[in-house]
Interface confidence: low
């Protein structure tokens, strides 16, 4: 099938004190192949401060993925979502409150 | 190779601005954040703050947030430092860096020499 | 803020002897986000140890950096001429990113 580039989310939820959780969702992309990973100051992080889902089929003929990692409270303009998909690549900001969320599609 | 490539030397008079340079080379320039960090003469290192050049997104150090302005020209490949109201004691060399693992700064420009005398 | 405080701020110290360089944080860092530079006269500074421990692209072996929560050194098992020079730490753990106030290492 043709490229279907992801709808890209980004959230956060209250962790521990102190700490919130942040989650990269990646969404109705299509092929299977994605990078999702979040980065601080710009770098990656390293493997072993995320937890990533599988590559699931969402059952439109498109794959769903996220990526997850803790981070401190009043840290998170430091964080961003870097995806890569089908040579297209994209960052997405941590939102600023609880109640919000960040819906990026990309072409 | 990478290469961070600062603009020359500075004299500025007290109350000036001065804007100051940082080609890179060598990388995907938004790949990396840029930092600026100062010194004075005979001091330690100070950062002033970075900027992400693929989203713009700037961070600045508070104590030097209300006069310094980064920005990036992602054309070019280029940041760029501007500090403005320059006083006697913002006489330092000023670096970029590049952004490395875990918030160090793996690369560093040569650094520009900026003077404020009357 | 987290401060860093280097110890001791000279080392006079001769060519062969073994150099110990402290850093002591105001409060806990990941020792993920602790590491040194080196900075010669004239020179910009330049990476040597990340996270604590790992040696940065084209740095000798002689140079090591261990230490966890709040004290962290970096030693230099047997000086060469080329080492003396001023030693920064410097955090990323937590904004704004700060440095220590260096220790100079200069020849006794």
């Known amino acids: 099938g043709s490229t279907v580039p992801p709808m890209v989310n980004v959230t956060r939820s209250e962790a521990s004190e102190g700490n919130i959780t942040v989650t990269c969702r990646a969404s109705s992309f299509y092929p299977r192949n994605i990078i999702l990973t979040w980065r601080q100051d710009g770098v990656s992080l390293s493997h072993d401060t995320q937890q990533w889902g599988d590559v699931l089929p969402d059952g439109n003929g498109t794959y769903q993925t996220w990526v997850a990692t803790r981070i401190c409270r009043g840290e998170e303009q430091r964080f961003t979502c870097y995806m890569e998909h089908s040579g297209n690549h994209s960052t997405h900001p941590v939102p600023s409150g609880n109640s919000h969320h960040h819906h990026h599609h990309h072409h | 190779e990478v290469q961070l490539v600062q603009s020359g030397a500075e004299v500025k008079k007290p109350g000036a601005s001065v804007k100051v340079s940082c080609k890179a080379s060598?990388?995907?320039?938004?790949?990396?954040?840029i930092y600026w960090v100062r010194q004075a003469p005979g001091q330690g290192l100070e950062w002033i703050g970075y900027i992400d050049p693929y989203i713009g997104r700037i961070i600045y150090n508070q104590q030097f947030k209300d006069r310094v302005t980064i920005t990036a020209d992602t054309s070019t490949s280029t940041a760029y430092l501007e500090l403005s109201s320059l006083r006697s004691e913002d006489t330092a060399v000023y670096y970029c860096?590049?952004?490395?693992?875990?918030?160090?700064?793996?690369?560093w420009g040569q650094g520009t020499l900026v003077t404020v005398s009357s | 803020e987290i401060v860093l405080t280097q110890s001791p701020a000279t080392l006079s110290l001769s060519p062969g002897e073994r150099a110990t360089l402290s850093c002591s944080a105001s409060?806990?860092?990941?020792?993920?986000?602790l590491h040194w530079y080196q900075q010669k006269p004239g020179q910009a500074p330049r990476l040597l140890i990340y996270r604590t421990s790992n040696l940065a692209s084209g740095i000798p072996a002689r140079f090591s950096g261990s230490g966890s929560g709040t004290d962290f050194t970096l030693t230099i098992s047997s000086l060469e001429p080329e080492d003396f020079a001023v030693y920064y730490c410097q955090q990323g753990g937590s904004l704004p990113l700060t440095f220590g106030q260096g220790t100079k290492v200069e020849i006794k």
């Open positions: 860096s590049r952004s490395g693992e875990r918030s160090n700064f793996d690369y």
């Open positions: 060598g990388y995907a320039f938004t790949s990396n954040n």
């Open positions: 409060s806990s860092i990941s020792s993920n986000y």
